[in-house]
């Protein structure tokens, strides 16, 4: 899967759409790497 | 209101250096990563690296490794691009950018930052 | 690195046609390719995203689609505010890289 910083981006912002934003507050992308997904 | 504000334009001779200021405001900083992309008169947008502003961790486009160098003042909420032994091919607009996800979820750039190279 | 190639370079239409741009990528990105508008002294606007998604905002006559290699920006009906030059990028693989940009231009 790709990691780029832009990759990890878009992919945490569906992930926070699906789960309607219920993550925790450290969930963010320069927080997780691509292992995160 | 996401913001990203550039510093104004800069006038360098070959083999100087000019560092170009980028400050964010109406976001978590440290949260998204910041691009910086450049473009010169009559050419394609081209990507010189992006920083991490939260562990500083950076990424290069190798044209520019050695010659770039990406940081953050993170208390200012400012990214910073520095480009060293300039050349007449960096006159470019100069770029931040970066893709937030909250508030607002879109890729904000910067109004630009016009480098000219010039003897 | 990855090379985009855009195609047409520039070309020419009026109001209310429909606008196909196409970026070609030298090797597999998959769906990691952006689509940008530029106007003349401005910095890029952001419309599509991962192919095909729309940035919030952004109107509904732009739609992306594509995979692999082969990406297309399609405006469904041209208006008058869309005559500017589009770029494409892909991010799947570092360093990020763009096309050489399509002007779109009044007939």
């Known amino acids: 899967a790709c990691d780029t910083a832009t990759c990890v981006t878009h992919r945490l912002a569906g992930l926070l759409s699906r789960s309607g934003g219920v993550v925790k507050n450290n969930f963010v992308p320069t927080n997780v790497g691509s292992k995160a997904f | 209101e996401v913001q990203l504000v550039q510093s104004g334009a800069e006038v360098k001779k070959p083999g100087a250096s000019v560092k170009v200021s980028c400050k964010a405001s109406?976001?978590?900083?440290?949260?998204?990563?910041m691009n910086w992309v450049r473009q010169a008169p009559g050419q394609r947008l081209e990507w010189i690296g992006d920083?991490?502003?939260?562990?500083?961790?950076?990424n290069y486009n190798q044209k520019f490794k050695g010659r770039a160098t990406l940081t953050v003042d993170k208390s200012a909420s400012t990214a910073y691009m520095e480009l060293s032994s300039l050349r007449s091919e960096d006159t470019a607009v100069y770029y931040c950018?970066?893709?937030?996800?909250?508030?607002?979820?879109?890729?904000?750039w910067g109004q630009g930052t016009t480098v000219t190279v010039s003897s | 690195d990855i090379q985009m190639t855009q195609s047409p370079s520039s070309l020419s239409a009026s109001v209310g046609d429909r606008v196909t741009i196409t970026c070609k990528a030298s090797?597999?990105?998959?769906?990691?390719v952006a689509w940008f508008q530029q106007k003349p002294g401005k910095a890029p606007k952001s419309l599509i995203y991962?192919?095909?998604y729309r940035y919030s905002g952004v109107p509904s006559r732009f739609s992306g689609s594509g995979s692999g290699t082969d990406f297309t920006l399609t405006i469904s009906s041209l208006q008058p505010e869309d005559f500017a030059t589009y770029y494409c990028?892909?991010?799947?693989?570092?360093?990020?890289?763009f096309g050489g940009g399509t002007k779109v231009e009044i007939k």
């Open positions: 950018a970066s893709i937030i996800i909250v508030p607002n979820y879109f890729d904000y």
């Open positions: 109406g976001y978590t900083f440290t949260d998204y990563y």
């Open positions: 920083i991490n502003p939260n562990n500083v961790g950076t």
């Open positions: 090797q597999n990105v998959d769906t990691n």
């Open positions: 991962s192919a095909s």
């Open positions: 990028q892909q991010y799947n693989n570092y360093p990020y890289t």
